[in-house]
């Protein structure tokens, strides 16, 4: 029997029984907050091979192993992961060994087993026979491993059962318990499973098979099941579904949900019944399962209830994410916020079309409407009183309508009105009449020339560079020295910086009056002597990075036709010298022969520059004495167990330090310090823990139905 | 000929359970959700519970709880399992294959009569 | 959940006569609205399905309109046969419902 769509067991123990007759489980399973320690040895699902999506446990009190539970579960297939994880195995206080003694492939995803205070055998599994790649693995905060003494089958009595495999050059047993060993194929079978008896099996299963070669007999498939057999691809006329099988159409139109109505069921798209057409296409029709290609981004239509939608938060501007079309009226009154404008941006930034009026009044907030980024139509079909559909007033800090050289607005009916905006210049508005069609519409007192751009620099001349060099870190940077009339109304200039990957910025970006900037700002005093050229240094920049740059003059305000005169640069992108690469990350080695090791390494995070080519140096190390000091084998050797309490784990040393010359003198050697990249490791690891238990516990705890 | 064939109902006493079925036959069962209405006597129809083509299930606030709606596709048959029954569950009980949103016709079952009487 | 409203209760019309029922819905459904007929000691029989599709074997008489929250029910010219109760059914969103039925009787 398949279950599903997704299976959650909490609080009670017996909710288990829900799992007594599936075969697979379509969807995820988590076994979570069970608080009552209890005996779960009569439960026992021996059917259950397969989970599509990730296996979670988490706080279940008096569970010890997972093997009595689940005996044959064989394929995690990771079609949907947890955190990018396909089991995840927190918090379980009583667990003393996984036991998957069956579990024979992770076919997507990584595993997090993380907090276990009792967890053993967890150094005995070699998870790269179950995994493609183990990088990606984290175990961390279990049971040391040298506080489990872990025994493979037979090693007691010197008759080991299991074989052998190296990880991290420790050729080792290989199992999941004191009594099971880690299955593994002959190598004869390739990358293909294996029965029981090592015979191997048909190249469409996984994990394992009832019977050699035969597509029929398979515990589950590579690829996708179909009425009983393991298939490369979906026959004609059925589709993929859930990454494992395939079903008809009848089937697709057929699947609820309680979150969305009829009409927005399954769709099938590129042979593949899904949840909702991907990125870039959209239902043909409202009665039709098929998608096709949006032209442009995917329409959207969002509706007010009440006609007016009032933005006076990031909150209330959530409600219109992935909204193209608005229908009703928008008013913006945004009078303080963090980080506001990226936020808006975020929710609004789609949003191409709105029927009504636009109002923005009391922004104080905003310094551009850059936000709405892609806003091309206002229709006007409702206005404000006096026939306007687009009303900006009293926004004391809006310097910016949109950078009109890229930008197309129609505003189709209705007149602009715009008043008391002291750092929005008239020119501006003026430039918005010709690009909407709006000119001629407004009367005289509709943009007032007197109240708008009173406290801007309206009058502005164009400053330019004039020499920039630069290394790895720095860029140096001169432009000419900016005459006003006056020489002493120039005080300063600031130079405005910034990472951009793209020639494609505005100076408007990222910025609100509330204090938040995407540009990084320096300050420069003008140069002593008049004939020398400002500039400035530039420093502790990325290698190899493109920065866009530009420059102000700070002017006194000075009032020149009823307008302040002003001079900046143009943005300027240069970029750093590329430098050093970074360490390549995660390197593995392995042995697969007597005269061959295989080395592995993922890229460097920081490449600086285009890599070419890497460099891989080895030489011949001297056996390690030490390895064999002990028989680890023999129960007394052992050291005596004691409770990990599930924190992570500093290594201990165990040994009398080495005694070297130190500080001049003999004597036992201190740690080293650790370095700055050392600890910086170590910042990000705590805090990826703490966002990954963020996200556990968001994902999980939920209000109880009422 | 498509056809769904109900059986199982009968009298019970209040506080009771009763399983009924209904054997589809015709069609692809597994392909369909399948529902369960009833009509108590005198009165309207009332949708009860679904269960999808994945195995979802559904339920009016009426049943919520108390019913279990669930299907064995290899024997091409739908169950209702109905604990603590109450004197209002008495009614004449439906299975129902809706024709879902883009294709498919409606079938409906002969009816099967649960009394719930001490 | 969804409430479905079916007015009149009962309509008394002679036969050859048009007649009009109407369902409205608590909230919108689209076209996700189907329209049953059922006679005594019988099973429901679906009519009408979202909200104007007709369906094969079911008379040209019978007719449906609307979408949203307002639908229609036209039977252009009853006839001995039609004199039945008449059910509305929204399959939008779960938990479906049905309106709580309209009679139509001979005048």
């Known amino acids: 029997e398949i279950c599903g769509p997704g299976i959650d067991i909490r609080n009670d123990y017996q909710q288990l029984k829900r799992l007594e007759n599936c075969t697979v489980i379509e969807g995820y399973l988590h076994i979570l907050l069970i608080s009552k320690a209890e005996d779960y040895r009569s439960y026992r699902f021996p059917k259950l091979t397969v989970i599509t999506e990730y296996l979670l446990l988490f706080r279940v009190a008096g569970l010890e192993s997972l093997g009595d539970l689940f005996p044959n579960l064989t394929v995690i297939r990771g079609w949907k992961l947890f955190y990018n994880y396909a089991l995840v195995i927190f918090e379980m206080t009583n667990l003393k060994d996984i036991g998957l003694y069956n579990l024979r492939n992770i076919t997507r995803g990584a595993i997090r087993i993380e907090k276990n205070a009792d967890l053993c055998y967890l150094s005995t599994v070699d998870w790269s026979l179950i995994l493609d790649a183990v990088s990606n693995n984290y175990i961390v905060g279990n049971k040391p491993p040298k506080e489990c003494g872990d025994l493979c089958p037979g090693t007691m009595e010197e008759k080991p059962m299991c074989e052998k495999t190296t990880i991290n050059n420790e050729y080792n047993y290989r199992c999941w318990t004191t009594n099971r060993c880690q299955k593994m194929c002959p190598s004869t079978c390739g990358k293909r499973a294996c029965t029981e008896n090592n015979e191997c099996c048909h190249p469409e299963c996984l994990g394992s098979c009832s019977a050699p070669d035969n597509d029929t007999a398979c515990v589950a498939c590579r690829h996708y099941y179909y009425a009983g057999v393991c298939v490369p691809a979906c026959p004609p006329n059925t589709y993929r579904f859930e990454g494992w099988r395939c079903v008809d159409r009848d089937f697709c139109a057929n699947i609820l949900s309680a979150e969305s109505s009829d009409s927005e069921g399954f769709v099938i798209h590129d042979g593949e019944c899904m949840q909702e057409c991907p990125s870039g296409f959209i239902r043909n029709g409202s009665q039709s399962m098929y998608c096709i290609p949006c032209e442009g981004p995917c329409p959207k239509v969002c509706e007010e209830e009440k006609k007016t939608k009032t933005i006076d938060s990031v909150t209330s501007a959530q409600m219109l994410q992935g909204c193209t079309i608005f229908k009703g009226n928008l008013l913006i009154n945004i009078r303080r916020g963090n980080n506001i404008a990226s936020e808006l941006e975020n929710f609004m930034g789609l949003i191409e079309v709105v029927t009504g009026y636009v109002k923005i009044r009391h922004s104080h907030a905003l310094v551009s409407l850059s936000f709405l980024k892609n806003l091309r139509l206002i229709l006007g079909e409702e206005q404000l009183e006096g026939n306007y559909s687009f009303y900006v007033l009293d926004n004391q800090n809006l310097q910016q309508l949109w950078d009109w050289d890229h930008r197309n607005l129609t505003i189709k009916a209705g007149k602009m009105y715009f008043a008391f905006n002291p750092k929005l210049c008239v020119s501006e508005i003026y430039r918005m009449e010709e690009v909407t069609g709006t000119k001629g519409r407004q009367s005289k007192g509709d943009i007032n020339t007197r109240n708008n751009g009173e406290r801007a620099s309206c009058e502005s001349d164009v400053l330019h560079f004039t020499s920039t060099t630069t290394s790895k870190n720095r860029i140096i940077i001169t432009w000419h020295r900016y005459r006003p009339p006056d020489y002493r109304d120039l005080i300063s200039f600031t130079v405005y910086y910034k990472e951009a990957p793209f020639k494609n910025v505005t100076e408007y970006d990222g910025q609100d009056a509330c204090g938040s900037n995407s540009w990084n700002m320096v300050d420069v005093d003008l140069p002593p002597n008049k004939d020398v050229e400002p500039g400035i240094l530039l420093h502790g920049l990325k290698p190899w990075t493109q920065y866009a740059v530009y420059v102000k003059a700070v002017t006194l305000t000075m009032v020149e036709n009823d307008h302040i005169r002003g001079a900046k640069s143009e943005i300027l992108y240069i970029r750093t010298n590329a430098s050093v690469p970074s360490i390549p990350l995660d390197v593995l080695s392995a042995s697969n022969s007597s005269s061959q090791l295989i080395v592995k390494w993922n890229p460097p995070s920081l490449p600086n520059g285009n890599l070419s080519y890497y460099i891989v140096r080895w030489q011949r190390q001297p056996q390690d004495g030490y390895l064999y000091r002990h028989n680890y084998c023999s129960k007394d050797k052992i050291p005596i167990r004691k409770y990990a309490d599930g924190t992570i784990d500093i290594e201990e040393v165990t040994e009398n330090p080495k005694t070297e010359v130190c500080g001049g003198e003999k004597g036992p050697c201190c740690a080293c310090p650790k370095t700055e990249a050392e600890k910086q490791a170590e910042k990000e690891e705590a805090e990826y823990r703490k966002v990954f238990e963020n996200f556990l516990h968001n994902s999980i705890f939920v209000p109880r139905p009422e | 000929e498509v056809q769904l064939v109900q059986s199982g109902g009968g009298l019970v006493k209040p506080g009771g359970s009763l399983r009924l079925s209904c054997a589809a036959s015709g069609f692809t069962f597994s392909s369909f959700a399948m529902h369960w209405v009833r009509q108590a006597p005198g009165k309207g129809l009332e949708w009860i519970s679904v269960?999808?083509?994945?195995?979802?299930?559904y339920y009016a606030d009426s049943v919520k709880g108390r019913f279990t709606i669930s299907r064995d596709n290899a024997k091409n048959s739908l169950y209702l399992q109905m604990n603590s029954l109450r004197a209002e569950d008495t009614a004449v009980y439906y299975c129902?294959?809706?024709?879902?949103?883009?294709?498919?016709?409606?079938?409906w079952g002969q009816g099967t009569t649960v009394t719930v009487s001490s | 959940e969804i409430v479905l409203t079916q007015s009149p209760g009962t309509l008394s019309v002679s036969p050859g006569e048009r007649a009009t029922l109407s369902c409205r819905a608590s909230q919108s459904i689209g076209s996700s609205l189907h329209w049953y007929q059922q006679k005594p000691g019988q099973a429901p029989r679906l009519l009408i399905k979202?909200?104007?599709q007709s369906l094969s074997g079911i008379p040209d008489r019978f007719s449906g309109s609307g979408s949203g929250t307002d639908f229609t029910l036209t039977i252009s010219r009853l006839e001995p046969e039609d004199f039945a109760v008449y059910y509305c059914?929204?399959?939008?969103?779960?938990?479906?419902?049905f309106g709580q039925g309209t009679k139509v009787e001979i005048k």
């Open positions: 059914h929204q399959s939008s969103r779960l938990p479906h419902t």
């Open positions: 979202h909200a104007s």
């Open positions: 269960i999808d083509t994945r195995g979802a299930t």
């Open positions: 129902h294959r809706l024709g879902n949103f883009y294709y498919g016709m409606d079938v």
